[in-house]
């Protein structure tokens, strides 16, 4: 082992204080006791250490806790957290939401780093599920967090946590993710009345099946075109012209502007032209009058 440089006389640190910002890296290494550092971690964040000095402090903690830092230290890491690697973080056992918040605060305003992603993963796995308080915290710091999870990971979100989700939290979710979240949202909001229910469920409708869309069409919900365009194509296709008209209400005229885009384009192709004509929007591409429509999926099921 390399012989360590001795601490110069009179420079041994008795506490973590601002005098240490004037220590050279080797002096910090030699004169700061790791155990003292661990017990006074909460001071480190208040002292403007250089990145090089923070490297030394991290090294001292790594030597003291080779199996991973205790939560009492983790909670007060502050800017030292930015020095941690995902490998370091995988050794941690973070159970307190306050600790999670303290570390997310350090990274606030930045993209989710690999360190933060690892920290969140460790935290959620430790809790066993993504509870409401955790989800509240994570989406407050990272609105796109929910949509970064796999469908498998989303399956651990309890319906009660759905109340914490804001529309913007779902902006980047794909249909596979919404397929998992929608049934949870339906369950979470089931006791609400019609208009209130629609306001809450609207953001999740990209995962709704046909029968739920049919049911909504009977409730005068006036779905806007932006929401309609996010619906699953396979859920929209079986809807009749009358059902779409009821579903969209006054927004139905927006179909004309979207007639070349999915799911409107595919839906038009499935409707009788004379039914489309009843909308008075000039939608073209429907099935000409007199043609027989075979439902091949039904035929396959019977054979």
């Amino acid at each position: 082992e390399v012989e360590k440089t001795a601490c110069p006389s009179g420079k041994k640190a008795r506490e973590i204080d601002e005098s240490l910002i004037f220590y050279k890296k080797w002096e910090l290494e030699a004169c700061v006791d790791a155990a003292l550092l661990a017990t006074q971690m909460d001071r480190v964040n208040a002292i403007p250490f250089t990145y090089e000095q923070l490297d030394v402090l991290k090294h001292k903690l790594d030597e003291l806790y080779p199996q991973g830092y205790p939560e009492s230290v983790i909670q007060h890491l502050g800017y030292l957290f930015l020095k941690m690697s995902p490998e370091d973080i995988r050794k941690w056992n973070v159970t307190s939401l306050e600790t999670l918040k303290a570390l997310l605060e350090v990274n606030k305003g930045h993209e989710m780093s690999p360190q933060v992603a690892t920290l969140i993963d460790r935290f959620v796995k430790g809790r066993g599920q993504l509870d409401k308080d955790t989800l509240d915290t994570l989406t407050a710091f990272y609105p796109g967090y929910l949509c970064s999870l796999s469908p498998e990971e989303l399956s651990s979100v309890p319906p009660s946590s759905i109340w914490a989700v804001r529309p913007q939290d779902l902006d980047t979710c794909d249909p596979r993710q919404l397929d998992v979240l929608y049934p949870k949202a339906r369950l979470a909001f089931q006791n609400m009345n019609g208009s209130e229910y629609f306001v809450k469920i609207q953001s999740f409708l990209g995962g709704a099946p046909t029968e739920d869309l049919k049911a909504l069409s009977q409730q005068n919900v006036s779905m806007d075109l932006a929401t309609f365009m996010k619906l699953r194509t396979d859920a929209v296709l079986p809807l009749t012209v009358a059902e779409v008209q009821k579903l969209l209400g006054p927004h139905v005229e927006g179909l004309k502007a979207e007639e070349r885009h999915r799911p409107v384009r595919d839906w038009i192709l499935r409707q009788r032209q004379d039914d489309l004509d009843t909308l008075g929007l000039g939608l073209q591409g429907g099935i000409p009058n007199g043609y027989l429509v075979l439902d091949l999926s039904m035929q396959e099921a019977l054979s």
Epitope: G10, K11, D17, E18, S19, F22, D42, R43, A46, I47, P48
Partner: antibody, heavy 116, light 110 residues
Framework: EVQLLESGGGLVQPGGSLRLSCAAS????????MSWVRQAPGKGLEWVSG????????YYADSVRGRFTVSRDNSKNTLYLQMNSLRAEDTAVYYC?????????WGQGTLVTVSS | QSVLTQPPSASGTPGQRVTISCTGS????????VSWYQQLPGTAPKLLIY???KRPSGVPDRFSGSKSGTSASLAISGLRSEDEADYYC???????????FGGGTKVTVL
């Protein structure tokens, strides 16, 4: 016990000079940054200058930059403030204080009066 | 005009809780530690709170400090007559490359 003792204050005419000293004891002087803070009669605190342990860089308030010079002698455990081109608005009690980010010990102060 | 803003005065009756605010900017309180100083009439200032919320030994736990964003506050609970003094907040300012104080708050015990 930490002690800071300022000296060198007094009455001086506008344009004149003074040199303040601060003798430190009870701590390892050479490990700590030191500062000067002043307080005009009936007014609040105003930071004047700061100096790190090795005198490497020196910091000054805009109001005194170019006129005041801070220095230290670690072998004598003493902090200095050389004040030139003094103005009436420099009249104040001058305190020396330990550290540069949180002043944990203060001297009792020395009064500097600039008047004709 | 001070870089850090404090109310000029605050008051309370014995036993009450008094809070003093200190507002700065991203270059001082927003990115550096805040300290609070107490100055009793006719004496030198004394450090009351450092590193935002730490108390030096000998300072009663009736005094507490906190910081959030670009603001800080000092709370005195269980106000006593001996707490009648001027209180100053201070912080390093990274833009000015110097230390800045608030204008001070005179606390009166009614």
């Amino acid at each position: 016990e930490v002690q800071l003792l300022e000296s060198g204050g007094g009455l001086v005419q506008p344009g004149g000079s003074l040199r303040l000293s601060c003798a430190a004891s009870g701590f390892t002087f050479s490990n700590y940054a030191m500062s000067w803070v002043r307080q005009a009669p009936g007014k609040g605190l105003e930071w004047v200058s700061g100096i790190p342990p090795d005198s490497g860089s020196k910091y000054y308030a805009d109001s005194v930059r170019g006129r005041f010079t801070v220095s230290r002698d670690n072998s004598k455990n003493t902090l200095y403030l050389q004040m030139n081109s003094l103005r009436a608005e420099d009249t104040a009690v001058y305190y020396c204080a330990k550290n540069m980010l949180s002043f944990d010990y203060w001297g009792q102060g020395t009064l500097v009066t600039v008047s004709s | 005009q001070s870089v850090l803003t404090q109310p000029p005065s605050a008051s309370g009756t014995p036993g009450q809780r008094v809070t003093i605010s200190c507002t700065g900017s991203s270059s001082n309180i927003g990115s550096n530690a805040v300290s609070w100083y107490q100055q009793l009439p006719g004496t030198a200032p004394k450090l009351l709170i450092y590193y935002n919320s730490k108390r030096p030994s000998g300072v009663p736990d009736r005094f507490s400090g906190s910081k959030s964003g670009t603001s800080a506050s000092l709370a005195i609970s269980g106000l006593r007559s001996e707490d009648e003094a001027d209180y100053y907040c201070g912080s390093w300012d990274s833009s000015l490359n110097g230390y800045v104080f608030g204008g001070g708050t005179k606390v009166t015990v009614l």
